[in-house]
């Protein structure tokens, strides 16, 4: 004959544990039912009565089977620099992530505690490493033969156009200007490979690297072991 199925609450056999979705209540010394996600324990079990569960109240949640007396509070509303990617429900906490153009400067278990605007590289500097959800943009000075004339968190240094005859030589923050005869070839705006040197190429004027400015946020963050990238702006 199959063993009798025990209904909660029941006293476990010596040395055995309670079943899945049950817990051992020290006071009652019985195996009792846990409450499901979205619930909490309203009345704990006794030797003769099982756990009484109640649903989580407004803006509170439980994600796991539990016997907690109160549900957990959902995190505060997402700030203006964040978007709510998961709403607060009975079974899950609210998750806030940084909106486009921002990155997570201080993360938490799920989502982001503190967002900061992505660094913008000034003219003469391009993006060396793009920003991600959790890391800032790294800027670098435009190498000879390349330029960036924008203040941007996405633009890289682009090669100067190649002129038959140069009217104004290009520099790190400005493209070469050709005379009215059209250039022999023009690099695609997004090209990253530098063309081979040619005698007609404009002379590149290397700017003196400017000190970086930190993002214009109302909080201070440790910058980490490496110095900040040059050519950034907080605009």
């Amino acid at each position: 004959l199959p063993a009798q199925v025990a209904f909660t609450p029941y006293a476990p056999e010596p040395g055995s544990t309670c079943r899945l979705r049950e817990y051992y209540d020290q006071t009652a010394q019985m195996c009792c039912s846990k409450c499901s996600p979205g619930q909490h324990a309203k009345v704990f079990c006794t030797k003769t009565s099982d756990t009484v569960c109640d649903s989580c109240e407004d803006s509170t949640y439980t994600q796991l089977w539990n016997w907690v007396p109160e549900c957990l509070s959902c995190g505060s509303r997402c700030s203006s620099d964040q978007v709510e990617t998961q709403a607060c429900t009975r079974e899950q906490n609210r998750i806030c992530t940084c909106r486009p153009g921002w990155y997570c400067a201080l993360s938490k278990q799920e989502g982001c505690r503190l967002c900061a605007p992505l660094r913008k590289c000034r003219p003469g500097f391009g993006v060396a490493r793009p920003g991600t959800e959790t890391s800032d943009v790294v800027c670098k000075p435009c190498a000879p033969g390349t330029f960036s004339n924008t203040t941007s968190s996405t633009d890289i240094c682009r090669p100067h156009q190649i002129c038959n005859v140069v009217a104004i030589p290009g520099n790190a923050s400005m493209d070469a200007v050709c005379t009215s005869t059209s250039p022999t070839r023009s690099m695609a705006p997004g090209a990253v490979h530098l063309p081979q040197p040619v005698s007609t190429r404009s002379q590149h004027t290397q700017p003196t690297p400017e000190p970086s400015t930190a993002p214009s946020t109302s909080f201070l963050l440790p910058m980490g072991p490496s110095p900040p990238a040059e050519g950034s702006t907080g605009d």
Epitope: C35, S36, P37, G38, Q39, K42, C53, D54, S55, E57, D58, S59, A87, T89, R90, E91, Q92
Partner: antibody
Framework: QVQLVQSGAELKKPGASVKVSCKAS????????MNWVRQAPGQSLEWMGI????????SYAQKLQGRVTLTTDTSTSTAYMELRSLRSDDTAVYYC???????????WGTGTTVTVSS | DIQLTQSPSFLSASVGDRVTITCRAS?????MYWYQQKPGKAPKPWIY???NLASGVPSRFSGSGSGTEYTLTISSLQPEDAATYYC?????????FGSGTKLEIK
């Protein structure tokens, strides 16, 4: 579009039981909690209880504890509310309503009129 | 249980009027929810999380409030707004509803 279609009107004698069904369509049944709310003639709304179809767990209004049982049949996407030991003041329209895991009732059933009279 | 008291319980107003319905809670609540119900029909969700309009609700409706006092406002009453409006809370178990405000068009 999510729809909750309830069973037909019932006329019961005091002391009897009634079981009302609520069939859900066009959504994943276990993703939404099912609540039961009743409304006596000319009165406001009264919450009776909630069932979490994903887990089969329930929570009831204190006033009805012991007289009401909520169940679901996930294979047919149907929720049931059984009320026992009926009294004349149980005469009401009974609604099932989903809450989507939040704290308000976003989809309501068609309603089932239960009349308790000797 | 948290008691929700709605005022007025009955309101008669003309088309174009600005109408305000108040819901007072016996203790502080996090959010208030509102429903519209027409005779013989199930309630419809109308306003959630105090101030968000449910799908299909006209923009002339708005919700506000905090703590123990919440309001539903209709900026310019229309004939189709004639109905009974109920507030609801779930900041404390069990969830409770207000006694209702019946809105009639003069």
């Amino acid at each position: 579009q999510v729809q909750l279609v309830q069973s037909g009107a019932e006329l019961k004698k005091p002391g009897a039981s009634v079981k009302v069904s609520c069939k859900a369509s066009s959504y994943s049944f276990t993703d939404y909690n099912m609540n039961w709310v009743r409304q006596a003639p000319g009165q406001s709304l009264e919450w009776m209880g909630i069932i979490f179809p994903k887990y089969g767990t329930t929570s009831y209004a204190q006033k009805l504890q012991g007289r009401v049982t909520l169940t679901t049949d996930t294979s047919t996407s149907t929720a049931y509310m059984e009320l026992r030991s009926l009294r004349s003041d149980d005469t009401a329209v009974y609604y099932c309503a989903t809450d989507g895991g939040t704290w308000y009732f976003d989809v309501w059933g068609t309603g089932t009129t239960v009349t308790v009279s000797s | 249980d948290i008691q929700l008291t709605q005022s007025p319980s009955f309101l008669s107003a003309s088309v174009g009027d600005r109408v305000t319905i108040t819901c007072r809670a016996s203790s502080s609540v996090t959010y208030m929810y509102w429903y519209q119900q027409k005779p013989g029909k199930a309630p419809k969700p109308w306003i959630y999380l105090t101030s968000n309009l449910a799908s299909g609700v006209p923009s002339r409706f708005s919700g506000s409030g905090s703590g123990t006092e919440y309001t539903l406002t209709i900026s310019s009453l229309q004939p189709e707004d004639a109905a009974t409006y109920y507030c609801q809370q779930w900041s404390s178990n069990p969830p409770t509803f207000g006694s209702g405000t019946k809105l009639e068009i003069k």
